[in-house]
């Protein structure tokens, strides 16, 4: 019996036309939502004038439906048993699942001021930036609507910069009408243990952002894993959002709508400093902000963001070192709300439920030449927002799954 089931599973998880896996892979049958919480800065003047701790108050959730678009340019390659595709991006605001509207205002770090002062470190150029910041009446902080902050706005300071720079700024700009990829993944036809594992991303097996093994594109995209998942496995996956591969480890057995699943979580070790986890040495890219690579829980992805000083962390700096969160007041990290998990059905390797949580932060540093940054006495990794991207198998799909997969086994 088991061999028959294995044979059926192996057949059905192959990524080719006609399989259960393929149908759900091309266009996810699960509704995926991305909730945002924005960190509203309560004391902008005190920070700018006195280098006070930044007092933040999270506001949210503001919810968008995402990942509702089918994969595009799906192309099978029979020669190397891969399938390539683009994952289109789209986000639709869901007012009924949100605390307010996209027109709600927030006081946040001025993204352009923080980024430009980091990118252009030449002192003379910084004096020019200072003039343009002042002329545009920009400051260290700004008031922006949710829509502007997420999806983009024309920045008045950057509009004056005499160099050819993008004048539109937004944390996820550009997003709608763009696509992630090209991904090329193994379809599993010749070897089911490689199904969904990424062969190349944007035509390469490496990212060119990191040194050594940190630069590798490992595992799948976390939507599914090769079948017959064991609790002892370390599940590798690549996330373009954080510009790196990461891994999850088994935490517990969970019953999801009558389907036994394995809950895999991102362990704190994945965010540890090289002192505690030597494997992470290559994610430490500079010595000053990282305090000689002893800080942990924040990932400098500036190389992946055209030099903009973007730092990724878990929400509320969960699993981060005290020095990171010390200059920020109003954070309350807790594992239940702020960690990332994947609920994987072990026979098929399908992720039936997940919660991907991450926080977007921006580094801002003192600058002698830029008046609005002149009074800062320290570097700040400023939280801008955190997000919770979730998906759960629908009741109908769960019934079908139970009857066709788990029911047959039990």
């Amino acid at each position: 019996g088991d061999l028959l089931i294995q044979k059926t599973i192996k057949k059905q998880v192959v990524l080719e036309e006609g399989t259960i896996a393929f149908k759900n892979w091309v266009k996810t049958g699960t509704e995926v939502y991305r909730q945002f919480w924005i960190f509203d800065v309560q004391n902008p003047q005190e920070v700018m004038m006195n280098s006070s701790n930044i007092q933040v108050k999270q506001r949210g959730p503001y919810t968008y439906r995402v990942r509702f678009l089918a994969k595009e340019n799906v192309t099978q390659d029979a020669e190397d048993n891969t399938v390539s595709f683009l994952q289109p991006n789209g986000a639709i605001f869901e007012p009924s699942l949100s605390v307010g509207t996209e027109a709600d205002n927030f006081t946040v770090l001025n993204l352009a001021v923080a980024a430009a002062s980091h990118i252009y470190q030449n002192q003379f150029v910084q004096m020019i930036l200072n003039s343009l910041i002042n002329k545009s009446k920009s400051s260290m902080f700004q008031v922006r609507t949710l829509r502007e902050l997420l999806w983009g706005y024309r920045d008045p300071f950057l509009s004056l910069v005499p160099y050819p720079v993008t004048t539109t700024v937004g944390l996820f700009y550009p997003y709608n009408n763009t696509a992630d990829g090209v991904y090329k993944v193994f379809n599993g036809k010749d070897n089911i243990s490689k199904v969904a594992i990424i062969d190349t991303y944007k035509g390469k097996r490496n990212l060119s952002y990191w040194e050594s093994h940190c630069d590798m594109i490992n595992g799948t995209d976390a939507a599914s894993f090769p079948p017959f998942v064991e609790k002892s496995q370390v599940l590798q996956f690549f996330s373009s959002d954080i510009c790196r591969s990461i891994y999850a480890v088994f935490e517990s057995d969970v019953n999801l709508k009558g389907i036994p699943v394995y809950r895999f979580v991102l362990p704190s070790k994945a965010f540890a400093s090289p002192v505690e986890n030597p494997d992470n040495y290559c994610f430490c890219t500079e010595k000053i902000i990282s305090k000689n690579c002893t800080s942990y829980g924040v990932l400098d992805i500036s190389k992946c963001k055209e030099g903009r000083p973007v730092y990724i962390s878990l929400p509320h700096f969960l699993y981060a070192s005290p020095d990171v969160s010390e200059p920020i007041d109003g954070l309350n990290p807790n594992e239940e709300e702020h960690r990332t998990y994947l609920d994987i059905e072990p026979i098929t390797g399908f992720t039936l439920q997940f919660a991907k949580r991450l926080q977007v932060n921006l580094l801002v540093k003192p600058s002698e030449k830029i008046q609005v940054l002149k009074n800062l006495k320290r570097n700040y990794i400023v939280p801008i927002l955190w997000l919770n991207e979730t998906g759960t198998i629908g009741d109908e799909k769960a019934n079908m799954f139970r009857s066709q997969v788990t029911g047959k086994i039990n």
Partner: antibody, heavy 116, light 107 residues
Framework: QVQLQQSGTELVKPGASVKLSCKAS????????MHWVKQRPGQGLEWIGE????????NYNQKFKGKATLTVDKSSSTAYMQLSSLTSEDSAVYYC?????????WGQGTTLTVSS | DIVLTQSQKFMSTSVGDRVSVTCKAS??????VAWYQQKPGQSPKALIY???YRYSGVPDRFTGSGSGTDFTLTISNVQSEDLAEYFC?????????FGAGTKLELK
């Protein structure tokens, strides 16, 4: 538009001090750093130093430390440069120039002659 | 201090000609170079920043190029009003320094 009105020609004796002025208009004086540059007759340009009019923070060329002192008066949007212990080597035209897109606006210059 | 050498003190040209003024830095300054034009009895006028970007209002016959240590200001189709002294300036590091100047004269 940016305008910089510098004080007139100065004729001073060696060993004396002089204070040159540069009155700014057409822009927010405290928003742009002010630079001072020296040009001796028939010679090149030498950077003296810079001042942030918002808080009077200064940076000097090491060569002019002790020679030049930069100050501002925010109320009159005027930058000043005091030159002390004057010698014939200090005879030159002195320019003020605020940083906008660079040193893209210069005053008309003040001619200083040091002679006994 | 970074020394900027403008090897030619004088350059002779005719109206309509193309002329190149050079500037060599004693160490790498990236593209942190500006060019200025100065006519007798006048203040310097900024022409070029970041080695190759023209300030607004500067005629497009003025072109800047170079990076690292070697920089050139090219004036194509020289006009009589271009007869002046040209200075390069580096702002890669302090103190800011200028070249000694190159005077453009009529043949």
């Amino acid at each position: 538009q940016v305008q910089l009105q510098q004080s007139g020609t100065e004729l001073v004796k060696p060993g004396a001090s002089v204070k040159l002025s540069c009155k700014a208009s057409g822009y927010t004086f405290t928003s742009y750093w002010m630079h001072w540059v020296k040009q001796r007759p028939g010679q090149g340009l030498e950077w003296i130093g810079e001042i942030d009019p918002s808080d009077s923070h200064t940076n000097y060329n090491q060569k002019f430390k002790g020679k030049a002192t930069l100050t501002v008066d925010k109320s009159s949007s005027t930058a000043y440069m005091q030159l002390s212990s004057l010698t014939s080597e200090d005879s030159a035209v002195y320019y003020c120039a605020p940083i906008y897109y660079g040193l893209d606006n210069w005053g008309q210059g003040t001619t200083l002659t040091v002679s006994s | 201090d970074i020394v900027l050498t403008q090897s030619q003190k004088f350059m002779s040209t005719s109206v309509g000609d193309r002329v190149s003024v050079t500037c060599k830095a004693s160490q790498n300054v990236g593209t942190n170079v500006a060019w200025y034009q100065q006519k007798p009895g006048q203040s310097p006028k900024a022409l070029i920043y970041s080695a190759s970007y023209r300030y607004s209002g500067v005629p497009d016959r003025f072109t800047g190029s170079g990076s690292g240590t070697d920089f050139t200001l090219t004036i194509s189709n020289v006009q009589s009003e271009d007869l002046a002294e040209y200075f390069c300036q580096q702002y890669n590091s302090y103190p800011l320094t200028f070249g000694a100047g190159t005077k453009l004269e009529l043949k």
